[in-house]
Amino acid sequence: MKVLQEPTCVSDYMSISTCEWKMGGPTNCSAELRLLYQLVFQSSETHTCVPENNGGVGCVCHLLMDDVVSMDNYTLDLWAGQQLLWKGSFKPSEHVKPRAPGNLTVHTNVSDTVLLTWSNPYPPDNYLYNDLTYAVNIWSENDPAYSRIHNVTYLKPTLRIPASTLKSGISYRARVRAWAQHYNTTWSEWSPSTKWYNSYREPFEQ
């Protein structure tokens, strides 16, 4: 039994790091493999992650981590029974993929404006909380040519769009994702999309 593609890991910088790897052949990941991880730190303890299958030869493990900070470095040992298949390390702060924003809501009762709001996926005491910026994707299923990305570079998780910039009488969808500039993260996954109907009509000219 051997590792074909070494584990690569990303951290949500809150409580979970996800490691994925590929084996040389079909493997029952949860029955045959264990990923041991330990913070390189005083009085830290070794933890065991039971991997799940991710396709025929792929495995994925969700490592639980507390109080993730920039100095943290973990040793990783991949075992098949008594055989050490791979040994490596992982620094969560250098491989951050933020959690996806949630609770995306569209408010159309604001005059002449479509207001989108969503929730920051981190609690206020998390390091990423004040570092997230967002990208909001708006598109229309009725008008396949229409798709826009709005970059939200301020902290407040809101976006205002003049209703007049959208076609009246058709439906739109929106989704949002996040990244953290100072931690040089990748983009989060997109949030679930939300749909609304743009009923705004330009007032008649007097």
Epitope: F41, Q42, S43, S44, E45, D66, D67, V69, S70, M71, D72
Partner: antibody, heavy 116, light 111 residues
């Protein structure tokens, strides 16, 4: 909000032991390491050791090895620091502090006076 | 005896800027991250800066930190009388067994 409530002031004789408690609330107790540090009157801060509340593992500063014991009770979210063979130079304010590589939150401190 | 050296005292007038240095070595500041703590008279220390230059929520941006080589600096702008306190730098010794270190402390007086 996070609170670290420490036990009250103690007066001890040289050679005795003291046990200081630090009760945590407002966060997941087993998710954060707890440090102990002390500050002698008019002096700076001195690190004593650390406990991992999750499993109870400890690590102590070399200066206090053999004299200090840190324990925790997860049922009450409390950590304890016991210092034995007390001498006059152990007179200090003893702090518990939540954190790992740095110290996010501190208890108000417990004054331990060692005097014959 | 701490291996992180700070000036014993600094002073400045309200509204002014003051800096506090923290000098260490290659096995501590040079190979680790720096934090800063404020200790108001008669109270416990409070985290001001972590990760060399990051502020916890609730700490005003008048406080900033930087690190270069084996030394670090805390800067306080727009000094207020309420800033009068002792300030300590902190880092980790990485030479053998890792353990935290505190600086000697600096008393800030607002004139």
């Amino acid at each position: 909000q996070v609170q670290l409530v420490q036990s009250g002031a103690e007066v001890k004789k040289p050679g005795a032991s003291v046990k200081v408690s630090c009760k945590a609330s407002g966060y997941a107790f087993t998710s954060y390491y707890m440090h102990w540090a002390r500050q002698a009157p008019g002096q700076g801060l001195e690190w004593m050791g650390i406990i991992n509340p999750s499993g109870g593992s400890t690590s102590y500063a070399q200066k206090f090895q053999g004299r200090v014991t840190m324990t925790r009770d997860t049922s009450t979210s409390t950590v304890y620091m016991e210092l034995s063979s007390l001498r006059s130079e152990d007179t200090a304010v003893y702090y518990c502090a939540r954190g790992k590589w740095w110290f996010y939150d501190w208890g108000k401190g417990t004054l331990v006076t060692v005097s014959s | 005896q701490s291996v992180l050296t700070q000036p014993p005292s600094v002073s400045a007038a309200p509204g002014q800027k003051v800096t506090i240095s923290c000098s260490g070595g290659s096995s501590n500041i040079g190979n680790s991250y720096v934090s800063w703590y404020q200790q108001l008279p008669g109270t416990a220390p409070k985290l001001l800066i972590y990760d060399n230059n990051k502020r916890p929520s609730g700490i005003p941006d008048r406080f900033s930190g930087s690190k270069s080589g084996t030394s670090a600096t805390l800067a306080i702008t727009g000094l207020q009388t309420g800033d009068e306190a002792d300030y300590y730098c902190g880092t980790w010794d990485t030479s053998t067994t890792m353990y935290p270190l505190f600086g000697t402390g600096t008393k800030l007086t607002v004139l």
